[in-house]
């Protein structure tokens, strides 16, 4: 008789990424009997929660439950009911909540408390909501991309399973850009990591990894823009800010109270003779770039070398996956191709930023104006951060791979977080066993 497949024995996991600008829910699935194998966990669903990040609910915590409903209901639909009770749910909050906690620990705790109560109402195995550290965010992003790229697998393959795969087991570095922070994580060349805060040691699948990581709080793209505006308004002669990072003809009124709301602008805060100012775009990449470079203090370094603001950064090594906003922004600008050189990216940014706002609105009619207006800044910021901040060069640009998904799973910290919390990355290489005879009958 013909073999008949048994019902699949699978497990699920849910991770909510509570970022500074929005929350996303990810559902992961894997074969139960292959938990310790590398590369078996994959993403089956992403649900973007409508609305801002959870830190914005500080004055309306009672709305958090409703905010999370749609995506949690979607998880209920996707995951078979029989699996609900054994499906773990984790929520990790990142830099938006780190900033809120800096302002008020009490307010941050209140938000998390309501989030926990809301998530506990679902039939899943809720495991808690917490603010993850910048170091964790960097480390889990690094684990995610290398897990998905098959870098932890000891088996040498004659075929390539992923487009970015090189023929060796050298890990990829991870470059993550969010709204409020940015992380850089990689294995440096046989070099000591001079600052203990930036050093991580992992043993994964029987191999030791000495990893460098740093998270730059306030250097996510949204907070960097607030920093730049706060810096530039200091020297404005009146309530008009002629800004090279916005398209010619673009106009927007900004409340000074909003500008100084974030801890990220505290260093630029001053008493201004107006409550509001108007941004008037002049669309000049070179000037925008120059203004952004002023956010990076490169004059002080207590180590053999630094990124910026006195933070140790070893010499760059190997290939890097650049994901999250690095990818979303560059994808919008059509600059993710491996063939696009740093020089070409700069040229394209010059042309893009110089395009009149009315023209841009017509060309991208389907894109929300709030996002559309900021691509010139964001693209220029990415170039500035990579070149000035992290010391990539025209030569090493080809080692940056802008990645959205790998094998259908989003690049980001959430998968690595779940793999760690469910103990699915063993320290030692699992013994290879023959296929279970119970797979088919």
């Amino acid at each position: 008789t013909q073999n008949k497949a048994l019902p699949e024995n699978v497990k699920y996991g849910i991770v909510l990424d509570a970022g500074s600008s929005h929350t996303s829910l990810y559902i992961y699935k894997w074969p139960a009997e292959k938990e310790n194998d590398t590369g078996v966990v994959h993403q089956v669903e992403e649900c973007r929660v409508k609305g801002p990040g959870i830190s914005k609910f500080v004055q309306k915590v009672n709305e958090i439950g409703i905010y999370l409903t749609d995506c949690m209901e979607r998880a209920r639909e996707v995951i078979p009911r029989s699996q609900h009770q054994e499906t773990p749910v984790y929520l990790g909050a990142t830099a938006g909540m780190r900033l809120l906690r800096m302002e008020s620990e009490e307010l941050a705790d209140r938000v998390l408390d309501v989030v926990e109560r809301s998530l506990s109402n679902y039939p899943f195995d809720f495991q808690g909501a917490r603010i993850i550290t910048g170091q964790e965010e960097g480390a889990y992003g690094w684990i995610t991309i290398n897990y998905l790229l098959g870098k932890f697998s000891q088996k040498t393959r004659w075929f390539s399973i992923v487009p970015y795969e090189t023929n060796n087991q050298e890990t990829f570095g991870a470059l993550d850009l969010g709204g409020a922070s940015t992380q850089v994580t990689f294995v440096p060349q046989n070099q000591t990591i001079e600052s203990p805060d930036n050093a991580l040691q992992f043993r994964l699948y029987g191999k030791d990894y000495n990893v460098y990581t740093h998270s730059f709080l306030c250097y996510g793209k949204d907070q960097a823009l607030w920093q730049k505006l706060a810096k530039d308004i200091q020297v404005a002669s009146n309530e008009i800010l002629r800004d090279p990072c916005f398209h010619p003809g673009y106009k927007k009124v900004v409340n000074v109270s909003d500008l100084y709301k974030t801890p990220c602008t505290k260093r630029f805060e001053m008493t201004l003779p107006f409550q509001q100012f108007e941004i008037q775009g002049i669309g000049n990449y070179q000037q925008c770039h120059q203004s952004i470079l002023e956010l990076f203090n490169t004059s002080y370094c207590p180590y053999s070398q630094c990124a910026f603001n006195g933070i140790f950064l070893p010499p760059l090594q190997g290939d890097f996956g650049a994901f999250s906003a690095f990818y979303f922004v560059m994808k919008f600008l059509n600059l993710t191709s491996e063939k696009v050189s740093q020089e070409k990216v700069t040229e394209m940014m010059k042309k893009f930023c110089a395009q009149p706002w009315e023209e841009i609105k017509t060309s991208y009619a389907g894109v929300k104006e709030k996002y559309l207006s900021e691509y010139c800044f964001s693209g220029t910021y990415i170039l500035s951060l990579l070149l000035q901040g992290y010391h990539f060069t025209a030569d090493s640009w080809e080692h940056i791979h802008f990645i959205g998904k790998i094998q259908g799973s989003d690049a980001g910290w959430t998968l690595g977080y779940m793999l760690n919390l469910t103990n699915m990355i063993p320290a030692e290489q699992p013994l290879s066993t023959p296929l279970s005879h119970s797979t088919y009958v």
Partner: antibody
Framework: SVKEAGGRLVTPGGSLTLTCTVS????????ISWVRQAPGKGLEWIGI??????TYYANWAKGRFTISKTSSTTVDLKMTSLTTEDTAAYFC???????????????WGPGTLVTVSS | ALVMTQTPSSVSAAVGGTVTINCQAS??????LAWYQQKPGQRPQLLIY???TLASGVPSRFKGSASGTEYTLTISGVQCDDAATYYC????????????FGGGTEVVVT
């Protein structure tokens, strides 16, 4: 450390291969550059091979000079169609980083002399 | 093509004096600039990298600075041992260039 070898007298139009042997570090983690210096003149960059194997050359060196990794500890510089203008001390140098030369060259060989003359 | 213009080609200084050497990049090189010292018959030695970071074992009288695309090496309290030729080198872009090094500056100590 790095050390060059293979320099000698060659006739115009001839070819020559120089070898840079490294010790104490891995070529999978650092770039190696070739630089030359004609008698009484300044330093002239020829090209570089990065840890990935990617090579770059000075415009004037393209086509006539080839840099390649020949083993885990050696990098060769192959020179063809040599002229008297190519007479110089040839140095190999290690880049502080594996994927860029933005941090400079921190380890240089003593140089090997190539003389092109009939 | 990216060009490094180094000035002056030669400079003389008295012991204890100050020497300033400039290097102008034809485009932004994001502080990917190194300075080397070379004495006659010797190999070059790295002095400064990333425009202003002193290499290991280099005396603090050597100082590198940057302003836009202009880079400066300053030697304060010049000593006899500083008599050498100094070179700047950009490490930002290796494509479409003739030389990553500047032309060199000979420092004569009197």
């Amino acid at each position: 450390s790095v050390k060059e070898a293979g320099g000698r007298l060659v006739t115009p139009g001839g070819s020559l291969t120089l070898t840079c042997t490294v010790s104490g570090f891995s070529l999978s983690a650092y770039g190696i550059s070739w630089v030359r210096q004609a008698p009484g003149k300044g330093l002239e960059w020829i090209g570089i091979i990065y840890s990935s194997g990617r090579t770059y050359y000075a415009n004037w060196a393209k086509g006539r000079f080839t840099i390649s990794k020949t083993s885990s500890t050696t990098v060769d510089l192959k020179m063809t169609s040599l002229t008297t203008e190519d007479t110089a001390a040839y140095f190999c140098a290690r880049s502080r980083a594996g994927i860029s030369s933005g941090d400079g060259f921190d380890s240089w060989g003593p140089g090997t002399l190539v003389t092109v003359s009939s | 093509a990216l060009v490094m213009t180094q000035t002056p080609s030669s400079v003389s200084a008295a012991v204890g004096g100050t020497v300033t050497i400039n290097c102008q990049a034809s485009q932004n090189i994001y502080s990917n600039l190194a300075w080397y010292q070379q004495k006659p018959g010797q190999r070059p030695q790295l002095l400064i990298y990333r425009a202003s970071t002193l290499a290991s074992g280099v005396p603090s009288r050597f100082k590198g600075s940057a302003s836009g695309t202009e880079y400066t090496l300053t030697i304060s309290g010049v000593q006899c041992d500083d008599a050498a030729t100094y070179y700047c080198q950009q490490g930002f872009d290796s494509s479409n260039i003739d030389n990553t090094f500047g032309g060199g500056t000979e420092v004569v100590v009197t």
